[in-house]
């Protein structure tokens, strides 16, 4: 297994609809054809998997149907979108990239993107 550099933004603010997007870029040392991308969340001394997708270079990322993640790939960049976020989901979201095929296997882990989620205030009742 070999190490690989992964870059991602330090901070992202989720939209009022609970959607956050960020780019995960990896420095591929070779011509990988099969790539696995995993989003992890670190909070309260625990790391949990948020979502994961394996894709063939040049093809779309496919997350599971019930996944809160969607994404597109372009070269060595993956554009990730996480939806359905609430204030309690604020945390450090880490991009993990694995070059699965062909060998050798490469693993890269980003420094994490701190995603801040603010629940929208309910609209006040209108007098009209």
């Amino acid at each position: 297994c070999k190490a690989m550099h992964v870059a991602q933004p330090a901070v992202v603010l989720a939209s009022s609809r609970g959607i956050a997007s960020f780019v995960c870029e990896y420095a591929s040392p070779g011509k990988a054809t099969e790539v696995r991308v995993t989003v992890l969340r670190q909070a309260d001394s625990q790391v949990t998997e948020v979502c994961a997708a394996t894709y063939m270079m040049g093809n779309e990322l496919t997350f599971l149907d019930d996944s809160i993640c969607t994404g597109t790939s372009s070269g060595n960049q993956v554009n990730l979108t996480i939806q359905g976020l609430r204030a309690m989901d604020t945390g450090l979201y880490i991009c993990k990239v694995e070059l699965m095929y062909p060998p050798p296997y490469y693993l890269g882990i980003g420094n994490g993107t701190q995603i801040y989620v603010i629940d929208p205030e309910p609209c006040p009742d209108s007098d009209f």
């Epitope: 190490a3 992890l40 670190q42 001394s45 625990q46 790391v47 450090l92 880490i94 882990i109 420094n111």
Partner: nanobody, 126 residues
């Protein structure tokens, strides 16, 4: 809250083997840096081995190199210390320790640890 529990200690003859286990309760050890320390009677606690959060890096004290092997099985939420060719000087209480580092350090061992287990006694004697 995560707690670490060691097991696998016991009495073994010189040249024998033991496998210590460090299991987590109340959470997972995924991406945690895990270390094994030992304390012999009347001596200071010393670090024996550690494994990085990714499992890609392992370190060993000179006194156990080539005899001890640290490994992790995330599916079992457990870290192991395989101890071969045991010597009398390996006798002591062995402690499992852990720390979840920032992701930028997941490929490294921790310099200090937040969490300690209760320890398991290893005695090497004929």
């Amino acid at each position: 809250e995560v707690q670490l529990v060691e097991s696998g200690g016991g009495l073994v003859q010189p040249g024998g083997s033991l496998r210590l286990s460090c299991a987590a309760s109340g959470g997972t050890l995924d991406y945690w840096s895990i270390g094994w320390f030992r304390q012999a009677p009347g001596k200071e606690r010393e670090e024996v081995s550690c494994i990085s959060g990714t499992g890609l890096r392992t370190n060993y004290a000179d006194s156990v190199k080539g005899r001890f092997t640290i490994s992790r099985d995330n599916s079992k939420n457990t870290v192991y210390l395989q101890m071969n060719s045991l010597r009398a000087e390996d006798t002591g209480v062995y402690y499992c320790t852990g720390k979840l580092l920032h992701p930028s350090l997941w490929s490294a061992c921790a310099n200090e640890y937040d969490l300690w287990g209760q320890g398991t006694q290893v005695t090497v004697s004929s």
